[in-house]
């Protein structure tokens, strides 16, 4: 399987909210001994591999923001913690999962990574990730709403 990032760049005004999205593609094994671990974190375009370093998002680690299978947040404690930081991670049953960040500030600008781990018990873990850039802008040059740039081309879309 692969992870697709519909948008590679999100440009948003300060104070707005944004939902960063990843999608699971390809054949997904739903066998008894296969489970999925999904999470989000900030990173940098590292020398070895993009997304290899895992930095917190608003002081929340990738452990705090993880999801299981296609369901909702596994632990209420993590969910409540995320909400208090203006974050919410979610997942549907069609392979799409996302993180929503409210009240954006300039400090939120940077590289964001989604990570999916396919866990084949008794065999191995298979991990794939997607990366996207968030630029938070302020002042007269800032857009009124978030503008997203698809990964395949640089055509922009306004989202409200």
């Amino acid at each position: 399987f692969k992870v697709a990032t519909p948008y590679s760049l999100y440009v948003c005004p300060e104070g707005q909210q944004v939902t960063l999205t990843c999608r699971l593609l390809g054949p997904v094994d739903k066998g008894h001994d296969v489970t999925f671990y999904k999470t989000w974190y900030r990173s940098s375009r590292g020398e070895v591999q993009t997304c290899s370093e895992r930095r917190p998002i608003r002081n929340l680690t990738f452990q705090d923001l993880h999801l299981h299978h296609g369901g909702h947040q596994a632990a209420n404690t993590s969910h409540d913690l995320a909400q208090r930081h203006g974050l919410e991670s979610a997942s549907d049953h069609h392979g799409q999962f996302s993180i929503t960040m409210r009240n954006l500030t300039l400090l939120d600008s940077g590289l964001y990574c989604c990570l999916v781990v396919e866990i084949r018990h008794h065999h191995s873990e298979h991990r794939v990730h997607g990366a996207m850039e968030l630029q938070v802008q302020t002042g007269k040059d800032a857009p009124s709403n978030c503008v997203v740039y698809p990964s395949s081309s640089q055509d922009s879309e306004n989202i409200t």
Partner: antibody
Amino acid sequence: QVQLQESGPGLVKPSETLSLTCTVSGGSISSYYWSWIRQPPGKGLEWIGYIYYSGSTNYNPSLKSRVTISVDTSKSQFSLKLSSVTAADTAVYYCARDIPAFAFDIWGQGTMVIVSS
Amino acid sequence: EIVLTQSPATLSLSPGERATLSCRASQSVNYYLAWYQQKPGQAPRLLIYDAFNRATGIPARFSGSGSGTDFTLTISSLEPEDFAVYYCQQRISWPLTFGGGTKVEIK
């Protein structure tokens, strides 16, 4: 802050079953892998196996025939049973949280188990 | 199973010196390798994950490098509290395995 605490008898007779419990506090057990690792005196670390939050288990082939790991989510505990023990099973036994695609990030303090008659 | 071989078994150094510890895998583990520090009577502590990323709260003097089969843990300038045993561990496949350890002792 998640903490792990091992408990169980420190002395087991040869051929009997070693039973240990790990209590998880300060966080949910309904996530991650929950593993057992052991360390014979003066030696290195050996991964015994894990139970995943979903109930799936995975054991080291070298111990598989003798190992059972179970979980009681209502008590936030997971347990290790190792049957037909010998003196070679004498070790410090650690429970640990293992995060997918990451590492063993939280460990119990360890409990010494001696196999002797 | 994947066998991890650590060398040297013992490293005798003085505080302030640079320590270089090696871990070699019997087959490629990509960069899916962690390093742990263990002091007498204590549980291991995670230092490095994915070969070169420091875990939360680990001082910058610890650094990891390598990929495939050859990995290195470097302590740039040894502090008194760094004298301990260090283990590498792979997680590309099960069973998860550890190296035999390198003891860093005071010279």
